[in-house]
Amino acid sequence: AILGRSETQECLFFNANWEKDRTNQTGVEPCYGDKDKRRHCFATWKNISGSIEIVKQGCWLDDINCYDRTDCVEKKDSPEVYFCCCEGNMCNEKFSYFPEMEVTQPTSNPVTPKPP
C-alpha cells in the first residue's frame, strides 16, 4: 500500500432490485481487481420528491474520478441517478450531494442506509 492512500478491500453492498437480480439485499462486498489497479466503493441513489431511495451500493473498479476521495460525494448538477465513489473500506456507508455548478449555497443530503 502507498502511504496516504486508503486501500479499498470491502464496501457496503446494497441492491434495491435484489429479488429480480437474485442477490442479497444488503451486506459487505469484498472488492477484487487486477494487480496495479485501484479499487473503490460506490453508491447510487434517486431523489424522488425529496425522498432518498438507494439503488445500489458496492465495489467499483479503478477510476480516476474516485482517486483520493475519502467521502462519497456526487458533484454533478441534478443527475437522473446520483452516483458517487470513494476510496477506503466501507466509505460508501454515507454519501452526499454537493453540486459543483450551484451559484447558491450547496446543500448536503448525507444518508445512512436504514436496515430493511
Partner: antibody, heavy 115, light 111 residues
Framework: QVQLVQSGAEVKKPGSSVKVSCKAS????????INWVRQAPGQGLEWMGT????????SYAQKFQGRVTITADTSTSTAYMELSSLRSEDTAVYYC????????WGQGTLVTVSS | QSALTQPRSVSGSPGQSVTISCTGT?????????VNWYQQHPGKAPKLMIH???KRESGVPDRFSGSKSGNTASLTISGLQAEDEADYYC???????????FGGGTKLTVL
Amino acid sequence: QVQLVQSGAEVKKPGSSVKVSCKASGYKFTSSYINWVRQAPGQGLEWMGTINAVSGSTSYAQKFQGRVTITADTSTSTAYMELSSLRSEDTAVYYCARGGWFDYWGQGTLVTVSS
Amino acid sequence: QSALTQPRSVSGSPGQSVTISCTGTSSDVGSKNYVNWYQQHPGKAPKLMIHGVSKRESGVPDRFSGSKSGNTASLTISGLQAEDEADYYCGTFAGGKYYGVFGGGTKLTVL
C-alpha cells in the same frame, strides 16, 4: 475470465440506424464503465462515448452527439450502442471496452453502410 | 478534446529499442497521469499494454515501459521481437467527467 461478446456484422442503408450489443461476463457488470470505440478501414481508433453501467450516466464525443445513444441493461449485463442517420463514412468496426482504462475489449462488430 | 499526436511509423531491428511518443497539451497529458498504451495486431481488437502512464498490465512483458515528460508520454519497447510488429495507440482514461481521446496510431515495423 472477463469477456465482452459483441453482436454480429451488419449491413445498413444510408439514413438508417444500427444497434450493436456487447454482453459482459466474468466480472460484475455494474462495477465500471463501458466505452465504445470505432475504427474505419485502415484508420485509427476513435472514441465515441461511455456509460456508467450502474447509474446509466453517459458522455459522448462531440462528433457523435445527437447521433449516438449508449444504454446498458443490468439484468442481462449487456451494453448497447445505437448510431442513427448512418452514412457511408460510418462503415467501421465498432468495439466495446470495459472500464475507463479500456482494459478488456470485445471482438468488434463490422458495420457496413452501403446503398 | 483534440487528438493526441503520434509519429506515423517507427522501425527497429530485433533486439534494439524503440520509443513511440504521444504528445498532448498541458491540460491533458501534461497534468494527468491518465495516458494508456494499446497494441493492435492486424484484424484483432486492441490490447491494453500500459495504463496510467507507466503501469504495465499483467502478462505484458517488462520489455514494454511507459513514461512521461511534460506534455509528452512515451512507450519504450526494448529487446524488440518479431511479434512486437503491430500498431500502437496512446489514449486517455474515459469515464465520469473525463472524455476519451486517442492518438492517430504508430505502425511499428521490426526489420
